[in-house]
């Protein structure tokens, strides 16, 4: 038999060489081309296991889109036809709670999760007899990577800063079931950087297959939380990185989410984008924002894929994506997942299991409406999945998909066997569908969430609400004391109130300067390399948020450290959530906050507000009767008509849908 090469097993402390057999009703036989369902016999540690696999229908599309760039830097859009793909999920016969994510493209490769152990399997290189290596995931050597630096190691602050333990509080939410009853769908977009592409021999097909494999692994991990991972896009930076990847992980993450907001969202709708990099950050495996999955500006993460296997890498991406989904680190909390360590442990442990804490954190996100974008089942042309009636995803050629026959019994609008609408039905799902009928035009379907948002209405001929728009970034709000930024009026008092309760407000400026000039975990302008950055005086208002008049201590599923700094007869309050340095700190001043006349915070710097590119003269463009929205169209006040608010009408914009119904003007907002 062929012996494994050094490269293939150098990362393993123990492994076995096995020959899996494919099962048919008649006999064991050698493998053959991909089927929708397949079973194998696999040996592991002296035991034979029968595994049953089914093609992961929900993973990939008809119009699987891959973005690349030619030598001139021109964007190329490719739709490779990969309907009959070779990525499977399944279970081990007779093993309770087992799960499998395997590809059967060139031999078997993937993960088997049994009750007490996870195994990796991969084809033995240069074997002509279908031999494979099987190993426990615990036996994979891993560099001690962290999702950032542990804050516990940072020395105590100077004596004049009184660090206070917050008073103990009852949890906001009682312990609930781990798995939410309603399936959530994460529309995931993956971007692969130039160095990783080079590392893969500049082979686009190999990169694509590896990322589909990764998405299949992620799906197998998230399914325990009733979350499905749907890969909606892949971009490979074939011609060079489109962001600056020099600097610390925080800098790169900031650059990536800015690029995503400017260039990617407009091209392909998605809930979270994850950048895959070859370059490491001195022991930091990745970095992501917490609870931002549905955010236009911050729904992203970065993940280091160096000299590790895709199986190990999957737990890093699961971890960073978990942060986007509102999950904090498990460290220091009473968490269990039935394994030595869980996915959201701050050390990149290679775990496959989410903890009870992760389930609770995600539930909090959904209860706080932070996960609204996860409710939509991806549209047929947006999911990388082979179409299949019954997968609860409305695929190309389907009008609805109510799931299993049992689930379809409860659906009055959808014909389960054909995935077509029942004869009397106009629609079966969507915000503008009720009782199998389109809601009338002018029905409010997405209300205004802040003074910087605008409402959207049903158009009367679609089950979907109009796409979400808001007031253009840079429009003045809060009586000219702030600017609109991504649909929110960003100002210090509001940020203090989110953290410290409704009576809190911004601390004096002297306080910001005094605290943020220190460059420690309670006062800084971000993190670079392995240390906190001191704020230059001109940037101090864009560092750690400082508040006064604090009467409540925050509870966000984790207990933060609170710091008070005495200043001129008042106490300035700041907070360190101790999330680890792979997580941008929610105790920092928000991006887009006004930090001076005509200035805003960006990347912890107070810069000219012209970076927002606000270019709307409301008097000229909207005749003084409206504002510009994020598509640069006028949203008119009630009484004036789009597109330019020149003539009498019922308000709204060309983007909002009709704001009234001719049959029933009582519907008007």
């Amino acid at each position: 038999a062929a012996r494994p090469g050094f490269q293939q097993t150098s990362h393993l402390s123990s492994y076995e060489i096995i020959t899996p057999w494919r099962l048919t009703r008649e006999r064991r036989e050698a493998p053959r081309p991909y089927s929708k369902q397949v079973s194998y016999v696999i040996q592991a540690e002296g035991k034979e296991h029968i595994i049953h696999l089914e093609r992961n229908k929900d993973l990939l599309p008809e119009d699987f889109v891959v973005y690349t760039y030619n030598k001139e830097g021109t964007l190329i859009t490719d739709h490779p036809n990969i309907q009959n793909h070779c990525h499977y999920r399944g279970y081990v016969e007779g093993v309770h709670n087992s799960s499998i994510a395997l590809s059967d493209c060139f031999g078997l490769r993937g993960l088997l999760h049994l009750e007490n152990a996870s195994y990796g399997i991969e084809p033995l290189q240069n074997s002509s007899h279908f031999e494979h290596i099987i190993y426990r995931m615990d036996d994979v050597y891993k560099e001690p990577l962290k999702c950032g630096v542990s804050n516990k190691d940072i020395e105590k602050e100077t004596a004049k800063d009184e660090e206070e333990e917050p008073p103990s509080m009852t949890q906001l939410l009682r312990r609930r079931r781990a798995v939410l009853p309603q399936t959530r769908y994460v529309e995931l977009f993956i971007v692969v950087d130039k160095e990783r592409y080079d590392m893969m021999g500049r082979n686009q097909t190999a990169v694509r297959e590896e990322m589909i494999l990764l998405a299949n692994y992620l799906d197998s991990m998230y399914i325990m939380l009733n979350i499905r991972i749907v890969l909606v896009g892949l971009e490979i930076w074939t011609n060079g990185n489109l962001i600056n990847i020099v600097g610390g992980a925080g800098d790169v993450l900031g650059n990536f989410v800015q690029w995503r907001e400017k260039f990617l969202i407009t091209r392909r709708r998605h809930d979270s984008a994850q950048l895959v990099l070859k370059k490491g950050f001195g022991g930091t495996a990745g970095m992501a924002f917490v609870g931002t999955v549905c955010s236009r500006s911050h729904a992203g993460g970065i993940n280091v894929f160096g000299q590790i296997t895709v199986e190990t890498f999957a737990s890093i991406v699961a971890h960073e994506l978990g942060h986007n989904l509102g999950m904090n680190h498990d460290d220091g909390r009473d968490c269990s997942c039935g394994a030595k360590s869980c996915i959201m442990n701050s050390g990149a442990s290679g775990s496959r299991n989410f903890s009870s804490c992760s389930a609770e954190d995600f539930e909090k996100l959904t209860l706080n409406k932070g996960g609204n974008c996860l409710l939509n089942i991806p549209k047929p042309d947006e999911a990388y999945s082979a179409p299949s009636c019954g997968n609860k995803l409305v695929d190309a050629g389907e009008e609805c998909d109510c799931g299993t026959p049992k689930e379809c019994e409860l659906d009055p609008c959808c014909e389960g066997s054909t995935c077509k609408l029942k004869s009397f039905a106009e629609c079966a799902y969507g915000d503008c569908c009720k009782d199998c009928r389109f809601l009338p035009g002018g029905t409010l379907c997405r209300g205004k969430t802040s003074e910087c948002d605008v409402p959207e209405y049903c158009n009367g001929s679609s089950q979907f609400c109009q796409p979400d728009v808001f007031i253009q970034n840079g429009y003045p709000c809060q009586n000219n004391k702030a600017y609109c930024y991504n649909g929110m009026c960003q100002y210090y008092d509001a940020q203090c109130q989110v953290i410290f309760g409704s009576k809190a407000k911004a601390a004096p400026k002297d306080c910001f300067i005094e605290v943020n000039s220190k460059g420690d975990r309670f006062g800084n302008c971000g993190f670079s390399g392995n240390e906190y950055k001191k704020c230059a005086t001109g940037n101090a208002l864009c560092g750690k948020l400082q508040c006064e008049n604090v009467q409540e201590i925050p509870v966000f599923g984790i207990v933060p450290a609170i710091i008070q700094t005495p200043s001129r007869g008042t106490k300035c309050w700041g907070v360190d959530f101790q999330l680890g340095s792979d997580v941008p700190d929610p105790g920092m001043v928000n991006e887009g906050t006004k930090c001076g006349a005509g200035k805003i915070c960006r990347n912890f710097q107070c810069v000219d507000a012209s970076v927002l590119n606000y270019d709307c003269d409301v008097q000229k463009k909207c005749h003084g009767h409206g504002v510009c929205n994020s598509n640069k169209n006028c949203h008119c006040e009630n009484g004036w008509a789009p597109p330019n608010c020149e003539t009498k009408g019922y308000g709204g914009s060309v983007d909002s849908g009709p704001t009234y119904n001719e049959m029933n003007t009582a519907l008007r907002d």
């Epitope: 400026k509 002297d510 300067i513 006064e548 001076g596 006349a597």
Partner: nanobody
Framework: EVHLVESGGGVVQAGGSLRLSCVAS????????LVWFRQAPGKEKEREFV??????????DYTDSVKGRFTISRDNAKNTVYLQMNSLKPEDTAVYYC????????????????????WGKGTLVTVSS
Amino acid sequence: EVHLVESGGGVVQAGGSLRLSCVASGLPFSEYALVWFRQAPGKEKEREFVAGFAANGINTDYTDSVKGRFTISRDNAKNTVYLQMNSLKPEDTAVYYCAASWTPAYNDIPRHMSSMDQWGKGTLVTVSS
């Protein structure tokens, strides 16, 4: 371009009065806290907070040594801040500087030099005994 220009300084007998003015141009005046500092002779680089007026147009603040003698006021229509100085003492002798500071809290009056965004060139007040 932003300019702060002080005027009204001069020589005055102890017990006398002066009114300093500071005209601002090139900035949205009403968004700023306006502050007077002073620098006594021989105290280079050390400027003492004297009085300030918050951006909210209501709050004022004074250093203890001038309370009851000095009054700060502002006229947003004229983009001007004033410092009325009565019962002047020899120890009030200094170069008086006008400064402007944008603050996150509109009732805030910063007292630290480092919190100021713009400075004037100063006007000299000499109180003789």
